[in-house]
Amino acid sequence: KTLVLGKEGESAELPCESSQKKITVFTWKFSDQRKILGQHGKGVLIRGGSPSQFDRFDSKKGAWEKGSFPLIINKLKMEDSQTYICELENRKEEVELWVFKVTFSPGTSLLQGQSLTLTLDSNSKVSNPLTECKHKKGKVVSGSKVLSMSNLRVQDSDFWNCTVTLDQKKNWFGMTLSVLGFQKASSIVYKKEGEQVEFSFPLAFTVEKLTGSGELWWQAERASSSKSWITFDLKNKEVSVKRVTQDPKLQMGKKLPLHLTLPQALPQYAGSGNLTLALEAKTGKLHQEVNLVVMKVAQLNNTLTCEVMGPTSPKMRLTLKQENQEARVSEEQKVVQVVAPETGLWQCLLSEGDKVKMDSRIQVLSRGVNQT
């Protein structure tokens, strides 16, 4: 018995070959002997049953001369899964058609971090097929009648080529995934005290009409609880602020990409935030983490202090030195001090390995004079 695979809604070609490689009489039947179509010697395709009953069934007249009499079934339905009989040259060929349906749950447009389940359904009792989907960038996911893709990333978007294999017979189908998310899962901004701060949240997808709502929650390092800094709506890509905290006085752009500015980087704002975006007609939310590290350099009485506030890594080093001189203090901690600093230009650097994350300069006028 020959096996043919077909996807619901598409077409399948069931083979039937003559040994003499020339035109001959043939008949395609269902397993209950009802005639589907055939050729009875005049080179004319004769259909069985009523026209509407068999309008999905056809053959390739152009192939008859070569001794090939395939049965073409268009717009495949699940109930087409059965055995078909081709009668020719006093013999019967049995062809089994397995029609499968592919369902994507919850769909092919998902949010970053969500999972996709691809299910093959069929009303024929076939043994487990092998299903394999390959992304154009090389990622491969495989399963049987159920294939799962978890924790989807923006880079999983685009076309996937999927193959269903059963008894060495293959059928392929494509799926286009759209994974909506931010370009970066997390970002960190380093600023000197008093500088303006920019937070940008570019989306990694473009849609014609983007509608939803969002909020930025902020957990300051020095605060015991988080605070909602801003809430906003998004309609057809236009941002409108609903509510904004009075401290800090944030400004938000009305065009995408989502963009926020803080008038000043102050120690009390150092910390981390979480921007959430809920999109219309989508369950779940998009998230982007943003971190603010603030550097403060000050001279008070007889001591020069450099301090960083906010989420720094333990590998980061804070260095305080006179410009063009060797480091005076360099430690893997968040505060460094020099007592009785010499007059001149001092520099504080926050670095990780050989990479300087930020630096701040201060002019020390004379010992014991306040200067910030």
Epitope: Q196, E198, D233, K235, N236, K237, E238, S240, V241, Q251, M252, G253, K254, K255, H259, T261, P263
Partner: antibody, heavy 119, light 107 residues
Framework: EVQLLESGGGLVQPGGSLRLSCAAS????????MSWVRQAPGKGLEWVSG????????YYADSVKGRFIISRDISKNTLYLEMNSLRAEDTAVYYC????????????WGQGTLVTVSS | AIQMTQSPSSLSASVGDRVTITCRAS??????LGWYQQKPGKAPKLLIY???SLQSGVPSRFSGSGSGTDFTLTISSLQPEDFATYYC?????????FGQGTKLEIK
């Protein structure tokens, strides 16, 4: 061809009211953001009020908030500015302006209508 | 509201001169800034949008640059018809705000 035609200006006493209209044609009025901009005699330009094309949200300069109301009638392709509790400092030429499709500036302006607030 | 500081407030120049007008925003506004030209008794005219894009029909001697907080309008070679008042406008968010204007006069 895009056209914006303001009307409704005139002389009004302090504390009085006036409604300006801006008849628009030549573009999809319902989806375009629109604004009112004014210019006091011999002074610079001041943005007064705006209405979003996508969601109909309304926005105002602090100087007119609570006194002016911007609105639109999509069936008539007309933008309005309802001005109440008028003050002498509201005396200006009022322009209606159309924003570019992607909110990048005002690409078309009306000819302006003069509002004079005086007793 | 975001403040826009434009300078100079007035400027005298001759035909053929290269002229630069600057605008500074009190907040970072990306490139959400436009430049307008206004002649006496006339409505303003958009010259530059999105900080550096030339509006259709505007001569190429006009150019804009900058992003964040500092912006510049440059007229590479002044023509007699360029003597007018120029304004910058931030359209980063509402309420929109104009600069105070720069009056460009013939020297």
């Amino acid at each position: 061809e895009v056209q914006l035609l303001e009307s409704g200006g005139g002389l009004v006493q302090p504390g009085g009211s006036l409604r300006l209209s801006c008849a628009a044609s030549g573009f999809t009025f319902s989806t375009n953001a629109m604004s009112w901009v004014r210019q006091a005699p011999g002074k610079g330009l001041e943005w007064v009020s705006g209405i979003s094309g996508s969601n109909g949200n309304t926005y105002y300069a602090d100087s007119v908030k609570g006194r002016f109301i911007i609105s639109r009638d999509i069936s008539k392709n007309t933008l309005y500015l309802e001005m109440n509790s008028l003050r002498a400092e509201d005396t200006a030429v009022y322009y209606c302006a159309k924003e570019r499709d992607n909110w990048n500036g005002f690409d078309y302006w009306g000819q302006g209508t003069l509002v004079t607030v005086s007793s | 509201a975001i403040q826009m500081t434009q300078s100079p407030s007035s400027l005298s120049a001759s035909v053929g001169d290269r002229v630069t007008i600057t605008c500074r925003a009190s907040h970072v506004i990306r490139n959400d800034l436009g430049w307008y030209q206004q002649k006496p008794g006339k409505a303003p005219k958009l010259l530059i949008y999105a900080a550096s894009s030339l509006q259709s029909g505007v001569p190429s001697r006009f150019s804009g640059s900058g992003s964040g907080t500092d912006f510049t309008l440059t007229i590479s070679s002044l023509q007699p018809e360029d003597f007018a008042t120029y304004y910058c406008l931030q359209d980063y968010n509402y309420p929109y705000t104009f600069g105070q204007g720069t009056k460009l006069e013939i020297k």
